[in-house]
């Protein structure tokens, strides 16, 4: 005999009594598939989370992060503080990138400027806290009579860390 619970649509759950009637999900709960024996509690978007989509009887609430924070994790399960470009997040707050490093994002950590000389190139545009250096042609290419200019390419020693 087929379980009559399977007839209970999304937004309801199957009662425990013999008749197994379909009961609507109570407030702040939902069932997204048919045949559920209980409704799930709606996700609460609190603190650094804000509501992106309200909970309904058939679908859970969706959260994102309040202004100044960004989402991490599947379905935005975590919120991490933003910093400005040119900074990185530490436990003591947002800190400016050390000289010789940059961060072009509002999240993440600073990383060192490209070392143009490792690729035989010269610095065309200096780096800043927010931007990497731009490498130009090698010094030899800039001398009179030089015929070819190789395109800029980032080069860093593998595993190099800013100190």
């Amino acid at each position: 005999i087929q379980d009559s619970c399977s007839k209970c649509p999304a937004g309801t759950f199957c009662g425990k009594n013999k008749s197994q009637i379909c009961i609507p999900c109570p407030p702040n709960s939902f069932s997204s598939t048919s045949g559920q024996k209980a409704c799930d509690i709606c996700r609460q978007c609190e603190g650094v989370f804000r509501t992106k989509k309200v909970c309904s009887s058939t679908s859970n609430a969706e959260c994102d992060c309040i202004s100044g924070f960004h989402c991490l994790g599947a379905g935005c399960t975590m919120c991490e503080q933003d910093c400005k470009q040119g900074q990185e997040l530490t436990k003591k707050g947002c800190k400016d990138c050390c000289f010789g490093t940059f961060n072009d994002q509002k999240r993440g950590i600073c990383r060192p400027w490209t070392n143009c000389s490792l690729d035989g190139k010269s610095v065309l545009v200096n780096g800043t806290k927010e931007r990497d250096v731009v490498c130009g042609p090698s010094p030899a290419d800039l001398s009179p009579g030089a015929s070819s200019v190789t395109p800029p390419a980032p080069a860093r020693e593998p595993g190099h860390s800013p100190q």
Partner: antibody, heavy 116, light 109 residues
């Protein structure tokens, strides 16, 4: 949705080379760090190093510096971990994970077995 | 680089409180994160930035971090909490992430 999908299990002999991959999808692959984590059989997690795919800047754990190479090809949203000469002690599960401090997404792992 | 030390194993009766420590020089100066790993699965964040609990992680999980010790606390431990737990931190000295050795949590009975 965000996914990190790793290449399949590998069985190799000592001295052979190997390159395993981790393909990201569902997010801006170039602008998030990818880390590699080793787990030897029955042992704990060990952070190996990380790469910023946007410009391929790498940073290694001192324990793994010179032992492996981490690289990325942002055009195909893929990070790599490679060995030039495998040892039996490289037998482990290798995970890629998104992030540098908080690892919010993980690949399913690639089991590497090195045996003569 | 900082070294993080965890007890290899912790046992707790169902419904009781489990505490897993993670010791390291001045770990309180950095954020500590905690991961749960069940057999055959990839790790999952249960606590991030010392004390924050990701959405979907039960309220019985909490964390603290000061001085030389970070602590993961599981109140009213349930059988499903049986797993390996790892602390980790990112250090701005070597620009590296470090994991603790891991703690196997056994729920008795």
């Amino acid at each position: 949705q965000v996914q990190l999908v790793q290449s399949g299990a590998e069985v190799k002999k000592p001295g052979e080379s190997l390159k395993i991959s981790c393909k990201g999808s569902g997010y801006s692959f170039s602008t998030y760090w990818i880390s590699w984590v080793r787990q030897m059989p029955g042992k704990g997690l060990e952070w190996m190093g990380k790469i910023y795919p946007g410009d391929s800047y790498t940073n290694y754990s001192p324990s793994f510096q010179g032992q492996v190479t981490i690289s990325a090809d942002k055009s195909i949203s893929t990070a790599y971990l490679q060995w030039s000469s495998l040892k039996a002690s490289d037998t482990a599960m290798y995970y890629c994970a998104r992030g540098y401090g908080i690892f919010d997404y993980w690949g399913q792992g690639t089991l590497v077995t090195v045996s003569s | 680089d900082i070294e993080l030390t965890q007890p290899p194993s912790v046992s707790v009766a169902p419904g009781q409180t489990a505490r897993i420590s993670c010791s390291g020089d001045n770990i309180g100066d950095q954020y500590a994160h905690w991961y749960q790993q069940k057999p055959g699965q990839a790790p999952v964040v249960v606590i991030y930035q010392d004390k924050n609990r990701p959405s979907g992680i039960p309220e019985r999980f909490s964390g603290s971090n000061s001085g030389n010790t970070a602590t993961l606390t599981i109140s009213g431990t349930q059988a499903e909490d049986e797993a390996d737990y790892y602390c980790s931190t990112y250090t701005f000295v070597g620009f590296t992430t470090v994991f603790g050795g891991g703690t196997k949590l056994t729920v008795l009975g």
